[in-house]
Interface confidence: medium
């Protein structure tokens, strides 16, 4: 995992790390997450219910890192050294959108604004942490 830098102003009053319990997000390179996640879900159960909507897309295999990307938002990596959830970096989002949005559109689903790539940190953004996908994800 390659991680950018951290903006300390965004890290007040964080909840403790918890084990990843969402089936889709197990075995992707990290084991701990934190709620609320980057989409505002307050529990893993709530996140898992929404994440399930993407299961057919993950199974379709439109992008090799789609599962990792989705999990970085719905069950973001947590470490005791950093008090904010850590999302994927923007390039991974853009690659996933490029490959998967056309598939979604075939079924009358748009790429949701909650997954808006422009809202994610770039790899070298000095004000936010973000993750690159591991080679084996």
């Amino acid at each position: 995992l390659e991680i950018g830098r951290f903006d300390p102003e965004r890290g007040r009053g964080a909840a403790p790390c918890q084990a990843v319990e969402i089936p889709m997000c197990r075995g992707i390179g990290y084991n701990l997450t934190r709620m609320p996640n980057l989409l505002g879900h307050t529990s893993q159960g709530e996140a898992a219910a929404e994440l399930a909507e993407f299961a057919p897309l993950v199974q379709y295999g439109c992008h090799s890192h789609l599962r990792f990307f989705l999990c970085s938002l719905y069950a973001p990596m947590c470490t005791d050294q950093v008090s904010t959830p850590i999302p994927a970096c923007r390039p991974m989002c853009e690659q996933a959108r490029l490959r998967c949005a056309p598939i979604m559109e075939q079924f009358n689903f748009g790429w949701p604004d909650s997954l808006d790539c422009a809202r994610l940190p770039t790899r070298n953004d000095p004000h936010a942490l973000c993750m690159e996908a591991p080679e084996n994800a």
Epitope: A14, L38, L73, P112, D113, A118
Partner: antibody, heavy 127, light 107 residues
Framework: QVQLVQSGAEVKKPGASVKVSCKAS????????MHWVRQAPGQGLEWMGW????????KFAPKFQGRVTMTRDTSTSTVYMELSSLRSEDTAVYYC????????????????????WGQGTTVTVSS | EIVLTQSPATLSVSPGERATLSCRAS??????LAWYQQKPGQAPRLLIY???TRATGIPARFSGSGSGTEFTLTISSLQSEDFAVYYC?????????FGPGTKVDIK
């Protein structure tokens, strides 16, 4: 206190461009997206787009794509909206609006409502 | 583009009465809906976000409800300062869109 102060009224001729400024104060400028919304006389509200003051990234409504530019100056905590190729239908009050950041932990990723608005800038396009 | 429809277009209410405003979306917003109040010559003011959460400083007489495609703003007992135009807005998908507004005037 948190506030957004916009530049003064403008009168422009068709085909010209207008640049409206919005100066933020009372909060960390780079922590919240800034949006622009316009309102034609007697009409409703129309979203134009947003800028991420942290990175400079922008996103526009398809209707304005290619005609609108949004920029920011972090040294003065000011965002700018420039609209080109003006026509009479662009006569409106233009508002900047701060996107709320109700949970600093989830921040930018999740879209949110507009909690602070500028006072508005009247742009009149007339020949 | 998500289309928001507000009803009624105009609502005539007496002070002290209850006002119920409706906003319908052309597709599901989950709870990504806000309500704004606008008075003549003023900028809009955020009342409700997340469909049901009151913004800071908003009186308890304002309440929001609903999810998915059907949303309601209720003003439990109208005060003189509540007569204004009310807009709903969705921020689930770009382009973010507003409803056409409901004007609440004095009966």
């Amino acid at each position: 206190q948190v506030q957004l102060v916009q530049s003064g009224a403008e009168v422009k001729k068709p085909g010209a461009s207008v640049k409206v400024s919005c100066k933020a104060s009372g909060y960390t400028f780079t922590n919240n997206f800034m949006h622009w919304v316009r309102q034609a006389p007697g009409q409703g509200l129309e979203w134009m787009g947003w800028i991420n003051p942290n990175s400079g990234d922008t996103k526009f409504a398809p209707k304005f794509q290619g005609r609108v530019t949004m920029t920011r100056d972090t040294s003065t905590s000011t965002v700018y909206m420039e609209l080109s190729s003006l026509r009479s239908e662009d006569t409106a009050v233009y508002y900047c609006a701060r996107e709320a950041n109700y949970d600093i932990l989830t921040g930018y990723i999740r879209p949110d409502a507009f909690d602070i608005w500028g006072q508005g800038t009247t742009v009149t396009v007339s020949s | 583009e998500i289309v928001l429809t507000q009803s009624p277009a105009t609502l005539s209410v007496s002070p002290g009465e209850r006002a119920t405003l409706s906003c319908r979306a052309s597709q599901s917003l989950r709870s990504k809906l806000a309500w704004y109040q606008q008075k003549p010559g003023q900028a809009p003011r955020l009342l409700i976000y997340g469909a049901s959460t009151r913004a800071t400083g908003i009186p308890a007489r304002f309440s929001g409800s609903g999810s998915g495609t059907e949303f309601t703003l209720t003003i439990s007992s109208l005060q003189s300062e509540d007569f204004a135009v009310y807009y709903c807005q969705q921020y689930a998908n770009s382009p973010w869109t507003f409803g056409p507004g409901t004007k609440v005037d004095i009966k």
